[in-house]
Interface confidence: low
């Protein structure tokens, strides 16, 4: 009866050897893609000149096989009843699901000089890195192959400054060959309502980003959910991604290869300015760019990447305030294409299909003393690239599904 | 068994300096945070001090703030606060509290009090002229 | 702050449930104690975590904002005030409940 399936759900979502949770924990059995979008700037010189508003393109998908390593280092705890693990990162890219090659080139911001007056503010080391820029050739925007804009280049003005800094830029650098964590998670042997929930991460039950309560690691990584979901049920999970904890709410019920699953969706709440959400207070760290915490829809996760002026949104500036959006021509914000959503089977807590879709942006302020940058009349949040990291269950793992789990509750 | 033991309390001028020393045994004391929580007579509890097993993270109650200070020694498992300009508010039982972790959640103003697993008996503090 | 009710009662094998309300999705503490200043004994940390020396008839859960400390099966040596404790975020600051008195009739 139902108390016998309780039971077995019970026994199997539980993250040690030999259950049906752990196998496909270790290792996904989903094939994640992450698709890419890159902005190409249209107007380069007109905004380095004018401090115009920049026209973009994008252009993609790019696609990446992601997530196909296993996860590492192992450890159980029987004691607190956590499971301990690092998740290696590794892309390899998919030609056929892409709409070019690694080796396209996009116009997009300079990310070096973007950043460095950001990082050093002191007027005299502005000097001395104009200098520097000048000489290396380098301005407000520069050419890069998608290669090395993702995963990274040595940029010819960092190699000039006379100190040891890394010389070595890339959205997503270093990727290949790092690993995720470490994890601890609770394994739900003594507690299923807490299974694959984060205990800690990289040794830590907070982030160290964030004031307060938003610095908090929440849930679990959004993989898997304790079991029995509910539809009143807050989903929360961290995302190391953008730097925080976030939620999802239940937005319908979706036939997904004949199992029934919830989906669930990031409400735009999550995004809101302190004024809308004031749960978001502490998510708002600096009173300028953010126009004293009224802006929304954009989250500066600079503290998380060394002081670099990144920010995280949406794609296409979804859900963000008419101030972010309106020195950028070329965006089409799309409820459809743009949100995230994780479709989640209620019985087991398991992710069958996930869409993850963010924006990278870095902020660009004017800068007197240097020239790339001088005549530019107010900041911008320039957009980089997006992705949509998609997974989605195979067909025998689906009919493997529906025999084990769902079909035996019918 | 998990055993704490404060000392230390005791009269107290107000104005004057205190130190408690609370001795920890029958855990690996390195591996988790502890901390200092207090009661006035006949009142609730109060939050007073925290630090991170590795003796990183430091977290004070908004009372003992720019008074307090919480230290410890790893090798002796011991956690000391040294509270200074004492009032006569800062009368009552100062328990040791240990976390059920290595860290406390930290908000600007202090730590999450929910993983607290176990506390020391207590020491009375009498701030009085 | 958190909101504890002030007292409730219940008679011997009665479950009782004690509720304290926080300030936004939280994670609670439960503490115990027989009598003013005398030594506090942790029943549920980390809303649901029971420590090993504790018995099964204490439980916690955790609803939205509501924390629930429930006792299966009350007994007269459970008699004690109980206090919550997790963080206030209307506050920005650690919080522990005024407590609730437990009587058993």
């Known amino acids: 009866g139902d108390m016998l399936i309780e039971k077995t759900i019970k026994r199997e979502v539980v993250l040690e050897e030999g259950t049906t949770a752990f196998k496909n924990w270790v290792k996904t059995g989903t094939t994640v893609y992450r698709q890419f979008w890159i902005f190409d700037v249209q107007n380069p010189d007109d905004v380095a000149k004018n401090s115009s508003k920049i026209k973009v393109k994008q252009r993609g998908p790019y696609t990446y096989r992601v997530r196909y390593l296993a996860k590492e280092n192992i450890t159980q705890d029987p004691e607190d009843h956590t499971v301990s693990f690092v998740q290696p990162n590794g892309a390899i890219f998919e030609p056929s699901l892409s709409v070019g090659t690694e080796d396209d080139n996009f116009t997009v911001l300079n990310l070096a000089v973007a950043a460095a007056p950001h990082i050093y503010q002191n007027s005299f080391v502005q000097v001395v890195l104009n200098s520097l820029i000048k000489k290396s050739k380098s301005s407000m925007f520069q050419t890069r192959s998608l290669k090395e804009l993702l995963w990274g280049y040595k940029d010819p003005f960092l190699s000039l400054v006379p100190y040891p800094i890394s010389t070595t830029v890339g959205v997503f650098y270093p990727y290949n060959d790092t690993v995720d964590g470490v994890y601890k998670v609770f394994n739900g042997k003594d507690n299923i309502s807490k299974v694959a929930i984060i205990e800690s991460y990289k040794g830590k039950r907070n982030l160290s980003y964030w004031p307060s309560y938003c610095d908090m690691i929440n849930g679990t990584d959004a993989a898997s959910f304790p079991p029995f979901v509910e539809k009143s049920r807050t989903l929360r999970f961290f995302s190391s991604d953008i730097c925080r904890s976030i939620y999802a709410v239940f937005g319908s019920e979706i036939d997904l290869k004949g199992i029934p699953v919830y989906r669930f969706v990031l409400p735009a709440n999550a995004f809101a300015s302190p004024l809308q959400n004031p749960d978001n207070h502490c998510f708002c760290t600096e009173k300028v760019i953010s126009n004293n915490c009224t802006s929304y829809g954009v989250l500066d996760i600079g503290k998380c990447k060394e002081g670099k002026p990144v920010y995280i949104s949406l794609p296409h500036f979804l859900h963000a305030s008419p101030d972010v959006s309106e020195p950028i021509e070329g965006l089409h914000p799309n409820e459809d294409e743009h949100r995230t959503y994780l479709d989640v089977e209620p019985i087991t807590g398991f992710t069958l299909q996930f869409a993850k879709r963010l924006q990278v942006n870095i902020l660009v302020k004017p800068a007197r003393k240097i020239e790339a940058l001088k005549n530019l009349k107010r900041p911008y949040i320039v957009p980089i690239l997006w992705l949509n990291e998609t997974g989605t269950i195979g067909d025998e793992k689906a009919e493997m599904f529906k025999t084990q789990v769902t079909g035996k509750i019918k | 068994a998990v055993t704490l033991d404060e000392s230390g309390g005791g009269l107290q001028t107000p104005g004057g300096a205190l130190s408690l020393v609370c001795k920890a045994s029958g855990f690996d004391f390195s591996s988790y945070a502890m901390g200092w929580v207090r009661q006035a007579p006949g009142k609730g509890l109060e939050w007073v001090a925290g630090k991170a097993k590795d003796g990183g993270g430091t977290a004070y109650g908004s009372a003992v703030k720019g008074r307090a200070t919480i230290s410890r020694d790893n090798g002796q498992s011991t956690v000391r606060l040294q509270l200074s300009n004492l009032r006569a508010e800062d009368t009552g039982v100062y328990y040791c509290?240990?976390?059920?972790?290595?860290?406390?959640?930290?908000?600007?103003?202090?730590?999450?009090?929910?993983?607290?697993?176990?506390w020391g008996h207590g020491t009375e503090v009498i701030v009085s002229s | 702050a958190l909101t504890q009710p002030s007292s409730v009662s219940a008679s011997p094998g009665e479950t009782v449930k004690i509720t304290c309300s926080g300030s936004s999705d939280s994670w609670y503490g439960w503490y115990q104690q027989k009598s003013p200043g005398s030594a506090l004994v942790t029943v549920i940390y980390d809303s649901t975590n029971r420590p090993s020396s504790i018995p099964s008839r204490f439980s916690g859960s955790t609803s939205g904002s509501t924390g629930t400390l429930t006792i299966t099966g009350v007994r007269a040596d459970d008699e004690a005030v109980y206090f919550c404790?997790?963080?206030?975020?209307?506050?920005?600051?650690?919080?522990f409940g005024a407590g609730t008195t437990l009587t058993v009739l």
């Open positions: 509290a240990k976390s059920a972790y290595g860290d406390w959640f930290y908000g600007s103003s202090g730590p999450y009090a929910d993983s607290i697993d176990a």
């Open positions: 404790g997790s963080f206030d975020s209307s506050t920005d600051s650690t919080a």
